[in-house]
Each structure stands twice: as C-alpha cells, then as structure tokens.
C-alpha cells in the first residue's frame, strides 16, 4: 500500500521539516522560517508558537518540531501545553483575587501553587496526632491509642495558637 501511495502521491515522500509545494510541481520544499512540519507528507507547514511576555521559550522551534513555552520566574503554567501563567505564592499561602494570602488555621499548602487544604483529621482513621500541622505542612498521624503498648501514651501536643491575622503579600 505504501508503495502504491507513493507512486500515486509524490507528497508522501516529503520528510518532516518540508512540505509538498503545489506551486512547484509538488516538490518537497523546506518549511519557511518560523514554521515546522513534524510528520512527512505535509502539504503545509504549521506556524511556530510564539513565547512572549509572561511566557518564555523552553524549547526553540525547529523545522521539525514546535516551540514550547513555560512561564517566567515567579509564575507557573496552567493548562496543557502551558496556555496560561499564574503567579506563584509561598508555601503556606494560596492565590486569591486579592493576591497571595496565608492559609487559614487548620489548612495548609506545601506548594507554590494551588489552594490551602484542610489538615488530615487523624481521628477519622482512629489515629492520633503525632506532629501538629502548620500553614506549610499537614499533620502527621501516629498510631491509634489502642495500638500503644500498656503504660505508654500517645504524644499529642496541644493545638498551636491561632496564627496572627493575614496581611497581603
């Protein structure tokens, strides 16, 4: 089938990085600047993606592959292929309409992106709190009191005092 197709369609012989030029008797012409073809047999080359502004070039466009963008420092990508950039916050914060805000008491965020999530409720699994949670870290659950050897007691430090009021970054 491949041989039949190439006899009938000269374009199938054009490799990646070229296109089958109808204006020049269907000969294989190189992709023009700022365009690419990632597969053979293409009748046109695709325009390269441009990484500008909040985007920066992670991988340059070549005649056979598209450019890839990521976000400038202080931002992270959203969407497949980095279609949007969102501001980073510090660990222990989340991005709101008013900017980066500290996680409320009882919640944490261990990343520079995303939302603050509630601490794990150890008691739901019949366990006790081994290490208290912070704005940046979840609680660490320890063994349930019943699992402890006789005479031993669970180390359950007192809950931390409420953190000071939030102020915008």
């Amino acid at each position: 089938f491949e041989r039949t197709r190439s006899l009938q369609d000269p374009c199938s012989n054009c490799p990646a990085g070229t296109f089958c030029d109808n204006n020049r008797n269907q000969i294989c012409s190189p992709c023009p600047p700022n365009s690419f073809s990632s597969a053979g047999g293409q009748r046109t080359c695709d325009i390269c993606r441009q990484c500008k502004g909040v985007f920066r070039t992670r991988k340059e466009c070549s005649s056979t592959s598209n450019a890839e963008c990521d976000c400038t420092p202080g931002f992270h990508c959203l969407g497949a292929g980095c279609s949007m950039c969102e501001q980073d916050c510090k660990q222990g914060q989340e991005l709101t309409k008013k900017g980066c805000k500290d996680c409320c008491f009882g919640t944490f965020n261990d990343q520079k992106r995303g939302i603050c999530r509630p601490w794990t409720n150890c008691s739901l699994d019949g366990k006790s709190v081994l290490v208290n949670g912070t704005k940046e870290r979840d609680v660490v659950c320890g063994p349930s009191p019943a699992d402890l050897s006789p005479g031993a007691s669970s180390v359950t430090p007192p809950a931390p005092a409420r953190e000071p009021g939030h102020s915008p970054q």
């Epitope: 695709d46 500008k52 909040v54 598209n66 959203l78 292929g81 969102e86 501001q87 008013k98």
Partner: antibody
C-alpha cells in the same frame, strides 16, 4: 485586588493623536505586562499591541507606524498613543493584564474621533 | 495573521437547552484558544483558556473542546444570565486575533 482602569479624552479630532492611560493596582508593573485591545461600536475585538514586564513592546502590524505603548512605573501607569487618527479609530479601548489568556481587563474607555 | 471565524453569528436557544458555538482557525493553533463572554457595557470575561480549561469561578455548564483548527464552546443548560456575545481568541501567535463574535439570545 487586581484592577485596571483606562482614562483619557473621550473625543479626539481627526489627524490628531489619541492618548490613553491604564492605571493599575493589585500587581507589580515590573512583574506583569499589559495588552491594549480595542472594540469599535457593535464590532469585534482587535489586538493593538503589548508592553512586556521588561519594557519591550510588540505591535500589530496594522498599527505599527502610528502606535506607541509605554510604561511609567512610578505612577503605576501604562500608556497608549495612536497618531493620525480617523473615524475608523472610534472604539472602546481596553487594557488587559498579560497572563497568557486575558483574565483581567479594565472597564474600557470610549474614544470618538470626530471634528 | 491567523483568522478566527465563529459560527453562527447569532443563536437563539431555549432556557435549559444546550447552546453550541464554533470557532475555526485559519492555521493550526494547537489548544491555544480562549473563550470570552461579553455583556453590554462590560469588558470581555474569560470563560475558557487552553481550549478546554474552565477559568476560576466559571460555572461548570460552560465547557470548551477542540484542537488544531476547530474549537467549540458549549453551554449545557442555558440560563437567563448567559445572554451575551461570545468571542473566541487565539493566544498562539502574534498578532493575537479574535473571532467576530456570536450573539446568544433566548428563544
């Protein structure tokens, strides 16, 4: 809170220069750039150009000979200048923060070109 | 320049019914298409970015799909507050370009 507000004269005479400012708050001008986009009455959106956080600019080729976009960080303002205007430049002009997909826009300001 | 062509130009749909708006790009733009909603006297509001990602706070009745040259915005169950003009726009290559808009009304 992220806010952008366009301002400038609502009426400009033909052949004169249209000058608008975009005053921003809630984000740093050294971190984000701004795009200018316009919308003639009852029509669609047209990208004019952008200034990036480093101060460099990109313009739509349709405007390149008569457009200048600049920034004044001390005033938290971006500006748009469009020279030699005609009635075809009558539009609502918007500034929008550069985040890759225009999540934050100003309310827009209507500029009418008429003698 | 990449030309974005929307269809239809206007659309009337009954409350609670599905509304579908199409957008065709003159070149392959991957998934770098956004959808905006604009109500009279207001700036456009971002609904969808990256062809299919709902922006923060956008109701889940709005969804986007497509890649390459063909894109669709779907409103699964039309509400009265969805009456507006909808625009697609490509953020793939400069100059950035938008569709001509689709006016959505209630039947």
């Amino acid at each position: 809170q992220v806010q952008l507000q366009e301002s400038g004269p609502g009426l400009v005479k033909p052949s004169e220069t249209l000058s608008l400012t975009c005053t921003v708050s809630g984000f740093s001008l050294t971190t984000y750039g701004v795009h200018w986009i316009r919308q003639p009455p009852g029509k669609g959106l047209e990208w004019i150009g952008a200034i990036w956080s480093g101060g460099s600019t990109d313009y739509n080729a349709a405007f390149i000979s008569r457009v200048t976009i600049s920034v004044d960080t001390s005033k938290n303002q971006f500006s748009l200048k469009l020279s030699s205007v005609t009635a075809a430049d009558t539009a609502v002009y918007y500034c929008a923060r550069d985040d890759g997909s225009f999540a934050n826009w100003g309310q827009g300001t209507l500029v009418t070109v008429s003698s | 320049d990449i030309v974005m062509t929307q269809s239809p130009d206007s659309l009337a749909v009954s409350l609670g019914e599905r509304a579908t708006i199409n957008c065709k790009a003159s070149e392959n733009v991957g998934t770098y298409v956004s959808w905006y909603q604009q109500k009279p006297g207001q700036p456009p509001k971002l609904l969808i970015y990256g062809a299919s990602n709902r922006y923060t706070g956008v109701p889940d009745r709005f969804s986007g799909s497509g890649s390459g040259t063909d894109f669709t915005l779907t409103i699964s169950s039309l509400q009265a507050e969805d009456v507006a003009v909808y625009y697609c726009g490509q953020t793939y290559s400069y100059p950035l370009t938008f569709g001509q808009g689709t006016r959505l009304e209630i039947k």
